[in-house]
């Protein structure tokens, strides 16, 4: 129920967060699931626990396996599982699919590529970025905080982008890399007030309690490349990041697509294990560009069970 996949490369740092949430003040104990052996908290160990985080400094292929974390709340011990896989470094430049994070899309005026998982690490700017294993050089590339911005994006900017940074732990440095694909949509055109394609305003979506559901916020902003075009979800008028519900996550990055020549952006809100309280929330799809902001609201309702009757005589 409370399990999470994580992966990394041998000889790199890997930091994993316990899938069970909890207040930052709660003590978290980590164990090797197979042996029930406690993972030490002393930082002199290569693998050690630090609150909600499990640190491999550096990781080895033999570290692969399932790890148990127990969050000690004032009343109960709550258990989660981290499924960790450490892969050997590839001899060539190809990054296999199983090491790739989610693909992001961009355009001439919207070309942010976020470095995945970086928030778990103690790193300092600037990030190093590589495209198809070649270091990015030139004024078109700007490493800004935890993302890369490419000026005047062209179709041949598409490819696999790897961010590389140094994690510092007690004065010792460890390398971390993470790779994701970037696709480019390029077209000249115009900008206009956002038009939200989905959801319809005041729409109601039927969901089943206990199932997972996705809500797509999709809006079009004109034709061709857009300077500013963003869509996002809000819950009860609050940003997703301000909402303390780990089951509800907005897709990192935004996918840009072109529909009948129009520049459309979408982002997906993923709700895991739908609960009754989710039906009480107001889900706002916000579309914003230089012309202004448009908002469409969607609510969830419980799907009525259908009486499946046989049509056979």
């Amino acid at each position: 129920k409370f399990s999470k996949q994580s992966w990394g490369l041998e000889n790199e740092a890997l930091i994993v967060r316990c899938p069970r949430q909890g207040k930052s003040s709660y003590i978290v104990d980590w164990y090797y699931s197979q042996t029930n052996k406690s993972i030490p908290t002393q930082e002199r160990n290569r693998v050690f626990a630090s609150g909600q985080l499990l640190k491999f400094l550096p990781a080895e292929v033999a570290d692969s396996g399932i790890y148990t974390c127990i969050v000690r709340s004032p009343t109960f011990n709550r258990t989660g599982y981290a499924n960790v896989t450490i892969y050997k470094k590839q001899p060539d430049c190809n990054v296999p699919d199983y090491l790739m994070y989610s693909t992001v899309s961009g355009s001439e005026k919207n070309s942010k590529i976020y470095c995945p998982t970086i928030d778990l690490y103690n790193w300092t700017a600037p990030l190093e970025w590589f495209k198809n294993c070649q270091a990015l050089q030139g004024s078109r590339y700007k490493a800004h905080k935890s993302f890369l911005v490419i000026d005047n994006v062209m179709t041949d900017d598409a490819g696999d982008y790897t961010c590389k940074f140094i994690h510092n732990e007690n004065g010792a440095n460890y390398s971390v890399t993470a790779t994701r694909s970037f696709t480019v949509k390029d077209e000249q055109g115009f900008s206009r007030f956002p038009v939200i394609r989905a959801p319809a305003h005041n729409e109601t979506k039927e969901v089943e309690i206990g199932e997972n559901t996705n809500l797509t916020c999709s809006a079009c902003f004109g034709k061709g490349a857009q300077f500013l075009a963003t869509v996002q979800w809000q819950l009860n008028g609050n940003k997703i990041t301000d909402f303390s519900e780990p089951r509800i996550q907005q897709e990192e990055g935004q996918n840009q697509s072109f529909s009948n020549g129009l520049a459309c952006v979408n982002t997906v809100l993923r709700i895991a294990d739908v609960k009754e309280e989710d039906l009480l929330l107001r889900y706002d799809c916000l579309a914003l560009n230089l012309h202004g902001l448009r908002r469409h609201t969607i609510r969830l309702s419980r799907k009525n069970p259908i009486d499946h009757q046989s049509t056979y005589c």
Partner: antibody
Framework: QVQLQQSGAELVRPGASVTLSCKAS????????MYWVRLTPVHGLEWIGA????????AFNQKFKGKATLTADKSSSTAYMELRSLTSEDSVVYYC??????????????WGQGTLVTVSA | QIVMTQSPAIMSASPGEKVTMTCSAS?????MHWYQQKSGTSPKRWIY???KLASGVPARFSGSGSGTSYSLTISSMEAEDAATYYC?????????FGAGTKLELK
């Protein structure tokens, strides 16, 4: 929506026992711990104890350790609290309640309607 | 156990008046929850994690504090705010509540 339906008022003799029930609906019963709280004229709200319906693990306020027994029936999504050796001081309203986000202990967001227990000879 | 002391025990306020009630913990706690209860009804989660308003709570309410000292403030009292307010800590077992502050309409 999330609902906690408690059993009706009870009139019991001093020294006797009583079992209160709390039927949960609108969510997966085993996903959230169930807490029991009482309301007294002197102390206001007091936490009695809690049960994790998934494991049956319990946690108690030491004050109520010999007084209350907590159980849960997964098949009926119902939590129970047995109170024993009742005295007039136990004549108060008892609530079952749960947090909004179980892991983050973000306050008791859902409450039953309460069960009044009256201890009288 | 951590003892929660609420003050004042009873207070009254006129419509439009600013109201502040406090909750003092005998030991440091990491955050505070507040509940509103009206006579004959179940308590309602009102403010959680020290300063977050529960769903449906008017914006005139706010919460603040740290360590052993916390407070609930109503910027402008309204008739519907008359109720008993309880603070509660979830930092240590046993979970404990304050004895409540009864807010009356003047």
């Amino acid at each position: 929506q999330v609902q906690l339906q408690q059993s009706g008022a009870e009139l019991v003799r001093p020294g006797a026992s009583v079992t209160l029930s709390c039927k949960a609906s609108g969510y997966t019963f085993t996903d959230s711990e169930m807490y029991w709280v009482r309301l007294t004229p002197v102390h206001g709200l007091e936490w009695i104890g809690a049960i994790d319906p998934e494991t049956g693990d319990t946690a108690f306020n030491q004050k109520f350790k010999g007084k209350a027994t907590l159980t849960a029936d997964k098949s009926s999504s119902t939590a129970y609290m047995e109170l024993r050796s009742l005295t007039s001081e136990d004549s108060v309203v008892y609530y079952c309640t749960r947090a909004f986000d179980n892991d983050n202990d973000d306050g008791f967001a859902y409450w039953g309607q309460g069960t009044l227990v009256t201890v009288s000879a | 156990q951590i003892v929660m002391t609420q003050s004042p025990a009873i207070m009254s306020a006129s419509p439009g008046e600013k109201v502040t009630m406090t909750c003092s913990a005998s030991s440091s706690v990491n955050y505070m929850h507040w509940y509103q209860q009206k006579s004959g009804t179940s308590p309602k989660r009102w403010i959680y994690d020290t300063s977050k308003l529960a769903s449906g709570v008017p914006a005139r309410f706010s919460g603040s504090g740290s360590g052993t000292s916390y407070s609930l403030t109503i910027s402008s009292m309204e008739a519907e705010d008359a109720a008993t307010y309880y603070c509660q800590q979830w930092s240590s077992n046993p979970l404990t509540f304050g004895a409540g502050t009864k807010l009356e309409l003047k």
